[in-house]
Amino acid sequence: VPRWRQQWSGPGTTKRFPETVLARCVKYTEIHPEMRHVDCQSVWDAFKGAFISKHPCNITEEDYQPLMKLGTQTVPCNKILLWSRIKDLAHQFTQVQRDMFTLEDTLLGYLADDLTWCGEFNTSKINYQSCPDWRKDCSNNPVSVFWKTVSRRFAEAACDVVHVMLNGSRSKIFDKNSTFGSVEVHNLQPEKVQTLEAWVIHGGREDSRDLCQDPTIKELESIISKRNIQFSCKNIYRPDKFLQCVKNPEDSSCTSEI
């Protein structure tokens, strides 16, 4: 008789999840010489230990602590790029501007990027059928707790000028319910962070509006200012040109506004 299995509202664990995490770890440590000492089997064991045999609605930050320890990494605190709803461009940017880091440029972020995972209470099985949805099922699920944990720690580590890339094409350019709006903004340390600089990325080619005047950006400014951190905002009217100019800053067309 097949065992009864909890049906959740979200997609199940990404297929070949263990193999994917292990392969990503190996690849990351090969690309980043300073992380070559990392034992990827231990990393996988710590990752697995955070959610296997545990109820997928009862995961805590403490469950991920062994993994956090193994993911110890140097990140220049003044070179941190946060993002919200515009991950691809943020990653394209740090691939060119190699001295800046998004969370997904760290080992822990790289391991989990775009993956889903969960287990089942009291069995060592990974649930490939369904996992809890943050809204419909529960917020303390393995994926949400992981990202909340690493995002909080990443924001805590930031200093000096912190940059955030925001999607100007969305109705809420700054969304209080995003990971940036609900976690990272509130974990920037005012004693370490002088300024949060928002880069608002325009979508339309003919869009010349000043999106830094958007009400949600003003809301972000208010939240940040109340935390005794300065706020600045820049429109990136042409993201394609922006990336091109990061690659080739000497280009004569790069002196004009982008």
Partner: nanobody, 117 residues
């Protein structure tokens, strides 16, 4: 601006002891968890220990548990690491850093601990 200065390292025989200190400035020391991390020759960064801002909560890497003790004196803005029963594999440059990790940007020069007979 966060600034730290580590001291107390040196050459010690296996089984010996050392006490590292870290003088911090530029921030409200008691507001921040503090950590010790280390880097062995030719190796990557390894987390050693973390202590909460109040000093009431501590955590250690398995490799140093029972041998190392982290503490702090918030009135002196100073972090300590008492290292006992030292082993050759503890040889490393030790850095103190603000925060609990796993992402660190150590600001000091570090202090070299060499365990050798």
């Amino acid at each position: 601006e966060v600034q730290v200065l580590e001291s107390g390292g040196g050459l010690v025989q296996p089984g010996g002891s050392l006490r590292l200190s870290c003088a911090a400035s530029g921030f409200t020391f008691s507001n921040f968890a503090m950590s010790w991390v280390r880097q062995a020759p030719g190796k990557g960064l390894e987390w050693v220990s973390t202590i909460s801002g109040s000093g009431g909560s501590t955590d250690y890497a398995d490799s140093v548990k029972g041998r190392f003790t982290i503490s702090r004196d918030n009135s002196k803005n100073t972090l300590y690491l008492q290292m006992n029963s030292l082993r050759a594999e503890d040889t490393a440059v030790y850095y103190c850093a603000d925060g609990r990790g796993p992402f660190f940007d150590y600001r000091g020069q570090g202090t070299l601990v060499t365990v050798s007979s």
